[in-house]
Interface confidence: low
């Protein structure tokens, strides 16, 4: 190989060992029979050399640095050439470095030809191995602006006082152009300006200077985004740290088209704006840091650009001004994410503050819109607390547990509407009365409606799930001892049509000791399946539940248990079941941890089934499934 550098070129070439490898055989640069591992070629020199091995690219790298002095004379602006031409260089991993020094008053602009640049962060690399590393200067300090690959959105980077640009090309890459030009501009009065141009839908991830290390103290950095008129942009912060400020405050400022309050100032921890039409600027402003404990300011953010959907031009009013203790959350439903570009799915408050999820609270009217390619990607969860603090005031008071009609006007599916029903301990209990009698969901008779009510204890220490219930059964009411949550969960979009079937009334009633009482009036046409709360996990220790089963005058009820034995093993106490005729008060007691369960039995009158648990041994819990069928009486036995 021969490398000759003109005297006035201001270019130096350095060939040196790259990252050490575990190759057994060493390799040397051979210059007139002298072996060396480093070669430096300065302007005006011409050197002939070769390598002592067949694959020097596994051992050596080459750096070509050109110093461009804009302080003492005119600056060579325009397209930057690769000099010496790559065809004249040995096939090593090459880094071309351009070091441009200029006055503080002069702005320098790097312009990148298509394909533009894409910034990447720590631990990432470029698919083709071609990387651009760009640094600026603040006085004598070098500041890393960022490292970039091809195929992105970054079209221009403006700096002042100087630029150091490094283009890294793998040894096998055929590239022979730099892909950028330099132009002079007036002073930009900040560290740098990065212009990012979107041609269509897509996203860009960008980082503050020096990322992941700290952004220079009290500096200003600006990103300018060029967005096609028919698209919308949203900003989300992926990662940030704040330093310890002594004076001023770290912030981001936006110049947003059409905003009457430009610049719009946000803290880094705020929700960042979304659903923006047209070009906009984002600036990061540092502060004067505490000298003793500066901390670091760093920011990594994403700009997502996508088509506005029909829905995003609509404003929806969610009126929670008359609600109390209510929160409504719109959020993504859980899905596996595909690897291709997935448009963002945002919900926006006042059309500007957009995020992947949004929680609205009671006491206000909220205006929301959507920026989402497919609204089925979102769902809605609502929580409402109904609490009674004074038992004298609440007793016999009733509340309707009904999904407000406002919610049906929103274009996203309701997933859960949860009512937390809270009562004063040991003073009051609750009764749930459905508009339509309920069926308990069991494997034997699953619910097939578009929604169910999930009833569970709302006492943090108590793991008690009464079950899932849907309209169209035989349960007339459910009485519970203390705090519960009732969740209306939807399973199909047809819930909107079936909404009229929903409706539960809760009333506060005098306190009783049993965990739950189910009032059941079986239907003559079908089996009623009933099972103990906490199915599959076992009725909690020392818990008691009852079923009040009504038998019409002209019918006989057959009570059948699913298993011969419960399988419960008591560690302490006894588990028992009482079956009591309501008319005669005659009762039978069965020891569930010792006796077999009764064979199918007939009841001519209404009766109680009461189950009380012991403290079971682990893995030997109490789960009981039984069913009731009605048949017409053939003989009047009264």
């Amino acid at each position: 190989f021969e490398i000759a550098l003109p005297r006035e070129s201001n270019i130096t070439v350095l060939i040196k060992l790259g990252t050490p490898t575990l190759l057994a055989k060493p390799c040397y640069i051979v210059i007139s029979k002298r072996h060396t591992t480093m070669l430096s070629i300065k302007p005006g020199e011409r050197i002939l050399f070769t390598f002592s091995c067949q694959s020097p690219e596994n051992h050596f790298v080459i750096e070509i640095q050109k110093n461009i002095d804009c302080m003492s004379g005119p600056c060579p602006f325009g397209e930057v050439q690769l000099q010496p031409s790559t065809s004249l260089l040995p096939t090593l991993n090459r880094t071309f470095i351009w070091d441009v020094k200029a006055h503080k008053s002069i702005g320098l602009e790097l312009q990148f030809s298509i394909p533009r640049l894409r910034q990447f962060g720590p631990g990432e690399s470029c698919p083709d191995g071609v990387t651009y590393s760009i640094s600026g200067r603040i006085d004598a300090t070098v500041v890393r602006i960022g490292t970039f690959c091809s195929n992105g959105t970054v079209s221009r980077i403006k700096m002042q006082e100087g630029v150091k640009m490094a283009l890294h090309l793998p040894w096998f890459h055929p590239r022979n152009v730099s892909g950028f030009s330099i132009a002079n501009r007036s002073s930009i009065k900040r560290l740098c300006i990065i212009e990012s141009v979107f041609e269509g839908e897509g996203s860009a991830t960008l980082m503050s200077a020096n990322y992941p290390e700290g952004f220079p103290e009290d500096e200003l950095m600006t990103w300018q985004f060029v967005i096609p008129a028919h698209l919308r942009a949203s900003v989300s912060f992926l990662n940030f740290n704040l330093s310890n400020c002594e004076r001023k405050e770290e912030r981001v400022e936006y110049y947003i088209p059409g905003s009457t309050t430009n610049p719009e100032v946000f803290k880094l921890e705020d929700k960042q704006p979304g659903n923006m039409a047209g070009n906009f600027n984002l600036s990061l402003q540092g502060c004067d840091q505490d000298a003793q404990n500066p901390g670091i300011l760093r920011l990594q953010f994403q700009v997502l650009v996508q088509h506005p959907q029909n829905e995003s031009n609509k404003i929806y009013v969610v009126d929670l001004s008359n609600e109390r203790a209510t929160s409504l959350t719109i959020e993504p439903r859980p899905v596996k994410q595909s690897r291709k570009f997935v448009p963002g799915c945002f919900v926006c408050l006042e059309s500007r503050t957009c995020s992947t999820n949004l929680t609205l609270t009671s006491g206000s009217k909220h205006k929301i819109s959507f920026l989402c390619d497919n609204l089925t990607r979102l769902w809605m969860n609502v929580e409402k607390n109904i609490s009674c603090t004074d038992h004298r005031y609440c007793q016999r008071k009733s509340y309707s547990l009904q999904v407000p009609s406002d919610i049906f006007h929103l274009p996203v599916e309701l997933h859960d509407f949860s009512w937390k029903l809270l009562v004063p301990k040991d003073r009051l209990s609750l009764v749930l009365v459905p508009a339509q009698k309920l069926q308990q969901h069991t494997h034997e008779k699953p619910c097939n409606t578009s929604f169910s009510y999930l009833v569970a204890s709302a006492i943090p220490s108590q793991d008690l799930y009464f079950g899932s219930f849907c309209p169209g059964g035989s349960i007339e009411q459910i009485q519970v001892k203390q705090n519960i949550s009732v969740t209306l969960r939807t399973f199909a979009p047809s819930f909107r049509q079936e909404a009229s079937r929903q409706g539960l009334t809760v009333s506060f009633i005098p306190y009783f000791k049993e965990e739950g009482v189910f009032t059941v009036t079986p239907d003559t046409k079908s089996k009623v399946y009933l099972r103990t709360p906490n199915w599959d996990r076992g009725l909690p220790s020392l818990t008691s539940v009852s079923w009040n089963i009504s038998v019409p005058r002209d019918q006989v009820a057959c009570l059948t248990f699913f298993k011969e034995r419960t399988g419960v093993v008591c560690q302490t106490g006894r588990a028992f079941m009482i079956i009591q005729e309501q008319r005669t008060r005659a009762e039978e007691i069965f020891s569930l941890d010792e006796d077999a369960l009764p064979k199918p039995r007939f009841h001519h009158h209404s009766f109680w089934v009461n189950i009380s648990n012991c403290s079971p041994a682990s893995g030997k819990q109490l789960d009981l499934l039984f069913w009731v069928t009605l048949t017409p009486r053939t003989v009047d036995l009264t």
């Epitope: 720590p122 631990g123 990432e124 992941p212 290390e213 992926l238 990662n239 990594q300 959020e331 993504p332 859980p334 899905v335 596996k336 994410q337 992947t356 999820n357």
Partner: antibody, heavy 119, light 107 residues
Framework: QVQLVQSGSELKKPGASVKVSCKAS????????MHWVRQAPGQGLEWMGW????????TYADDFKGRFVLSLDTSVSTAYLQISSLKAEDTAVYYC????????????WGQGTLVTVSS | EIVLTQSPATLSLSPGERATLSCRAS??????LHWYQQKPGQSPRLLIK???QSISGIPARFSGSGSGSDFTLTISSVEPEDFAVYYC?????????FGQGTKLEIK
């Protein structure tokens, strides 16, 4: 308070499958990523991968691609690790831990689930 | 992937002595390094995040330092409950890796 409660120990035969659960409470599951870490008997910690709890998208370390599946059921605030075609060398304690999606540090850990694979 | 090498493998000290544990990364990882303590039969516990940031609830005798590829965990005066295994963890890029651990044992 924040808690990650894992399912109990499992004894499995080679070739079988196992599913370990990790129930999160005291915080909103979707606000933090969930990571899984393996510790073979007497050995150090190995990061297996993480699941984005907002999207359900899993990311696996190279050694854990194929037989290992991370999943989520946000309705019960639970993350799962499923291992299929179990081998003796899968015998280990498996931990779930809460992290941040970026630069994670694991501030809360489950109590660990011992999976023993033996014929 | 980033390889973390901890030294020494075992450190034998008496209560009251100063402990210095080292963790070296195979490449620069800035300050993306965290330290954990694990006692027998227990889950790991986060001690230090981002090389030097303290964690609430962790005694002040634990401190961290370093940046780039060399990191140190220091226990200013070892208490009896500090005898355990200590791991460093890189969170610089996937896959996140742990060091092989340093066992701090009673002399």
């Amino acid at each position: 308070q924040v808690q990650l409660v894992q399912s109990g120990s499992e004894l499995k035969k080679p070739g079988a499958s196992v599913k370990v659960s990790c129930k999160a409470s005291g915080y909103t599951l979707t606000d933090f990523s969930m990571h899984w870490v393996r510790q073979a008997p007497g050995q150090g910690l190995e990061w297996m991968g993480w699941i984005n709890t907002e999207t359900g998208a899993p990311t696996y370390a190279d050694d854990f691609k194929g037989r290992f599946v991370l999943s989520l059921d946000t309705s019960v605030s639970t993350a799962y690790l499923q291992i299929s075609s179990l081998k003796a060398e899968d015998t280990a304690v498996y931990y779930c831990s809460r992290g941040r999606d970026y630069d994670p540090h694991f501030d809360y850990w489950g109590q660990g689930t011992l999976v023993t694979v033996s014929s | 992937e980033i390889v973390l090498t901890q030294s020494p493998a075992t450190l034998s000290l008496s209560p009251g002595e100063r402990a210095t544990l080292s963790c070296r990364a195979s490449q620069s990882i800035s300050d993306f390094l965290h330290w954990y303590q694990q006692k027998p039969g227990q889950s790991p516990r986060l001690l230090i995040k981002y090389a030097s940031q303290s964690i609430s609830g962790i005694p002040a005798r634990f401190s961290g330092s370093g940046s780039g590829s060399d990191f140190t965990l220091t226990i200013s005066s070892v208490e009896p409950e500090d005898f355990a295994v200590y791991y460093c963890q890189s969170a610089h890029s996937f896959p996140y890796t742990f060091g092989q651990g340093t066992k701090l044992e009673i002399k």
